[in-house]
Interface confidence: low
């Protein structure tokens, strides 16, 4: 039997009966929860072979090895993965050892062992015959190896018998427990999977097979299961589901999601049943089981019950994400808040359509309304007394409303009103009247000139960048002087600049009234020298990375309407230079004759540049003959156990420190203090840790159902 | 579209073992459960018990348990259900119908239905 | 077993009149997935049932609108707002929550 769509076993050790009948788990299975020690001996699930998603073990005790209950698990698919792992085991107190000992294949995702204090048998299994890649993998805070002495079956009697494999240059035997090798196939299979008797399965068989080279006798699937056979794509009017199965039109319509209302069922799209449409696409009709590609971001309706919508932080924003048209009104009152405007921008920058109005007052943490970057039809259906669809009271830090060079807004019904926006230039709440199509709706008081843009530097005259140069990882730039009608009025010139991947930053972005701001910032002075130009030295920047930079003259003059005057330049785009690249990634090689090695790695994580050619080289090793000298029976004392209380802690060190030549003295040596660079990886290495945990607490404690 | 296709009638001896046929088209056979169930003369419907064509899998009604045995022919796509040692409380339609995969959110219903097999014991 | 009771036995309605039909189970049918699998089906004379409504209140393709359920727990109703023609037969709560899966006695919608 499919079991699905996720099984959560939690509390009470006897709703592991769930699983009885379960010959694959459509999804993940969890096991966590489980303070009470129970004897778990009776329970015995040799039907289940495959889990499609994740597995995840947390806090089950009295649990002592996984061989018992899950004999015959086989792939773990890892379709959807818990935080990149498809193995999760943390603070299992009991688990001796994982014990899974018919695990052939994890086919994606890392595995996740931590804090579990009495788990050993972990260096015995090579669990790149499982992985694809082990370099993820992380196996951290169990008991240490020292104290295990694992030992293979048959290694005390002389007469080993599990097959050896190398990791970590360590040549050993590899099992699950004590009496469990871990199995291993001919080389002559490759890639294959094969039987208990090591005869090669089918291509298309994943893990193990009943028989050899037979597609209907495959435990799981290589890529999809249709009608007792494993094919390598779906037949014609099936569809891919789940990432393991083909299933028809009839199977697809018939599936509810957990997420979705009854009305919306299943999709078909691109070959595969699928719970809703991908990124960029849209149902065609409400009822259709198609998608078609949205033009623009996919529209979504949003509305809300009391007509009108306040956005008076992030949290309230978040109920608008993905929303494209919005039926109602929107209130903006953000008066504080931390990072604020790509919040906003994350959870509201997709709308389109306000049918309503839209009031902006008292938010004194917005700097612009850029965060609204696809709003371009105010409807106006619903408007405020006095007329007004768009109104603007009371933001003391509003500077920017939106680039009018790239945008544009329609205000179909209704006037617009500001009034005490201190940063906010007149010009551009004209400019706004020209693009929305309300110039001439508003009366005098309207629109206040007097107490909007007061405090700014608002008929702005542009600097002219004169000179960039480039390097690696620097970038020197100089523009024209800039003399204010009284010099003493020139405070300084301010430069900003930032990443910038693609030429469509504004200087608005990612800015907000409480300090977050995208841009960094730097003062530069005036030379005194007046047939110098004003200039700065950008260091400590990427090689090959694209940056914005503009200037900003900061002064004090007074112009009419006592209006601050101010210069600033365009935004200049400029890319620094290329540079070596850092090392390829998890480099691995594997021989597959006796004249070839086949060699994989990972591009380099900064390629500082275009990579246009690799440089492999390798040179012939003398065979080290320690390994075959090496009796790895014969244990040196193996130390008396001690109880690892499941915490990560830097190992102690039981032998006296070495004697080396220090110095140029001999004595016992000090270990070497840490470098930065070692210190720095151990704090992020804790910080990983951190973030780990706290999405695993996040996503299985959840509120006991009403 | 997907059909279930049933013969129409069939006459039995008391005591002589039927077994009645079900031929799915036009669907995926191995996807869907097959049930089966009985209506006789003048009173509702039974629901008997059903079958996974993909691993035979059973579950039964107890009182049917002696009384129905049901297997499958997945490469000939057909559902078959033995009536055994059939008496004249037998004698009734019997249908066959399919039902989703039961698990999870998944929607469990029987949403195509065999037209019914009329089973007459008579000697 | 889970025993389905339907009430009324027969149900004589005019056409364009409301008929309201009581399902009551004798144990909750609240499956341990959380979903509660109760469903509605019709049968007219020398037909096989058709499928109405699922899972208490959703209604299934092509089911005109003035078919609906409600109800949770163990008591259910199916409601035909303004009965037509075609409507008349005999109707049938089913629970697929709880093995064996249980049928209702049936109610035979009819002309007044």
């Known amino acids: 039997e499919i079991c699905g769509p996720g099984i959560d076993i939690r509390n009470d050790y006897q709703q592991l009966k769930r699983l009885e009948n379960c010959t694959v788990i459509e999804g993940y299975l969890h096991i966590l929860l489980i303070s009470k020690a129970e004897d778990y001996r009776s329970y015995r699930f040799p039907k289940l072979t495959v889990i499609t998603e994740y597995l995840l073990l947390f806090r089950v005790a009295g649990l002592e090895s996984l061989g018992d209950l899950f004999p015959n698990l086989t792939v773990i698919r890892g379709w959807k993965l818990f935080y990149n792992y498809a193995l999760v085991i943390f603070e299992m107190t009991n688990l001796k050892d994982i014990g899974l000992y018919n695990l052939r294949n994890i086919t994606r995702g890392a595995i996740r062992i931590e804090k579990n204090a009495d788990l050993c048998y972990l260096s015995t299994v090579d669990w790149s015959l499982i992985l694809d890649a082990v370099s993820n993998n992380y196996i951290v805070g169990n008991k240490p190896p020292k104290e295990c002495g694992d030992l293979c079956p048959g290694t005390m009697e002389e007469k080993p018998m599990c097959e050896k494999t190398t990791i970590n240059n360590e040549y050993n035997y590899r099992c699950w427990t004590t009496n469990r090798c871990q199995k291993m196939c001919p080389s002559t299979c490759g890639k294959r999977a094969c039987t208990e008797n090591n005869e090669c399965c089918h291509p298309e068989c994943l893990g193990s097979c009943s028989a050899p080279d037979n597609d209907t006798a495959c435990v799981a699937c290589r890529h999809y299961y249709y009608a007792g056979v494993c094919v390598p794509a779906c037949p014609p009017n099936t569809y891919r589901f789940e990432g393991w199965r083909c299933v028809d039109r009839d199977f697809c319509a018939n599936i509810l999601s957990a997420e979705s209302s009854d009305s919306e069922g299943f999709v078909i799209h691109d070959g595969e049943c699928m719970q809703e449409c991908p990124s960029g696409f849209i149902r065609n009709g409400s009822q259709s089981m198609y998608c078609i590609p949205c033009e623009g971001p996919c529209p979504k309706v949003c509305e809300e019950e009391k007509k009108t919508k306040t956005i008076d932080s992030v949290t309230s924003a978040q109920m608008l994400q993905g929303c494209t048209i919005f039926k109602g009104n929107l209130l903006i009152n953000i008066r504080r808040g931390n990072n604020i405007a790509s919040e906003l921008e994350n959870f509201m920058g997709l709308i389109e359509v306000v049918t309503g109005y839209v009031k902006i007052r008292h938010s004194h943490a917005l700097v612009s309304l850029s965060f609204l970057k696809n709003l371009r039809l105010i409807l106006g259906e619903e408007q405020l007394e006095g007329n007004y669809s768009f109104y603007v009271l009371d933001n003391q830090n509003l500077q920017q409303l939106w680039d009018w060079d790239h945008r544009n807004l329609t205000i179909k019904a209704g006037k617009m009103y500001f009034a005490f926006n201190p940063k906010l230039c007149v010009s551009e709440i004209y400019r706004m009247e020209e693009v929305t199509g309300t110039k001439g709706r508003q009366s005098k008081g309207d629109i206040n000139t007097r107490n909007n843009g007061e405090r700014a530097s608002c008929e702005s005259d542009v600097l002219h960048f004169t000179s960039t140069t480039t390097s690696k990882n620097r970038i020197i730039i100089t523009w024209h002087r800039y003399r204010p009608p009284d010099y003493r009025d020139l405070i300084s010139f301010t430069v900003y600049y930032k990443e910038a991947p693609f030429k469509n930053v504004t200087e608005y972005d990612g800015q907000d009234a409480c300090g977050s701001n995208s841009w960094n910032m730097v003062d530069v002075d005036l030379p005194p020298n007046k047939d110098v130009e004003p200039g700065i030295l950008l260091h400590g920047l990427k090689p090959w990375t694209q940056y914005a930079v503009y200037v900003k003259a900061v002064t004090l003059t007074m112009v009419e309407n006592d209006h601050i005057r101010g210069a600033k330049s365009e935004i200049l785009y400029i890319r620094t230079n290329a540079s070596v690249p850092s090392i390829p990634l998890d480099v691995l090689s594997a021989s597959n004759s006796s004249s070839q090695l086949i060699v994989k790695w990972n591009p380099p994580s900064l390629p500082n540049g275009n990579l246009s050619y690799y440089i492999v080289r390798w040179q012939r090793q003398p065979q080290d003959g320690y390994l075959y000298r090496h009796n790895y029976c014969s244990k040196d004392k193996i130390p008396i156990r001690k109880y690892a209380d499941g915490t990560i802690d830097i190992e102690e060190v039981t032998e006296n420190p070495k004697t080396e030549v220090c110095g140029g003295e001999k004595g016992p040596c000090c270990a070497c203090p840490k470098t930065e660079a070692e210190k720095q990886a151990e704090k992020e290495e804790a910080e990983y840790r951190k973030v780990f945990e706290n999405f695993l607490h996040n996503s299985i404690f959840v509120p006991r159902p009403e | 579209q997907a059909q279930l296709q049933q013969p129409g009638a069939v006459l039995v001896r008391p005591g002589a073992s039927v077994k009645l046929s079900c031929k799915a088209s036009?669907?995926?056979?191995?996807?869907?459960?097959m049930n089966w169930v009985k209506r006789r003369p003048g009173q509702g419907l039974q629901w008997i018990g059903l079958?996974?064509?993909?691993?035979?899998?059973?579950r039964l009604d107890q009182n049917f348990k002696d009384k129905a045995t049901l297997t499958v022919d997945k490469f000939s796509s057909t559902a078959y259900m033995q009536l055994n040692s059939p008496t004249s409380e037998d004698s009734a339609v019997y249908y066959c119908?399919?039902?989703?995969?039961?698990?999870?959110?998944?929607?469990?219903?029987?949403?195509?239905w065999g037209a019914g097999t009329t089973v007459t014991v008579s000697s | 077993d889970v025993l389905m009771t339907q009430t009324p036995l027969s149900l004589p309605v005019s056409l364009g009149d409301q008929a309201s039909i009581s399902c009551r189970s004798s144990q909750t049918i609240i499956h341990s997935n959380g979903n509660t699998y109760l469903e509605w089906y019709l049968q007219k004379p020398g037909q096989s049932p058709k499928l109405l409504i699922y899972?208490?209140?959703n209604r299934f393709s092509g089911v005109p609108d003035r078919f609906s359920g409600s109800g949770s727990g163990t008591d259910f109703t199916l409601k035909i707002s303004r009965v037509e023609a075609e409507d008349l037969g005999v109707y049938y709560c089913f629970q697929g929550s709880h093995v064996p899966y249980t049928f209702g006695g049936g109610t035979k919608l009819e002309i007044k």
């Open positions: 899972k208490v209140s």
């Open positions: 079958i996974h064509p993909s691993d035979s899998e059973t």
């Open positions: 036009s669907y995926s056979f191995t996807d869907y459960w």
């Open positions: 119908t399919r039902s989703v995969i039961y698990y999870g959110n998944y929607r469990w219903y029987f949403d195509v």
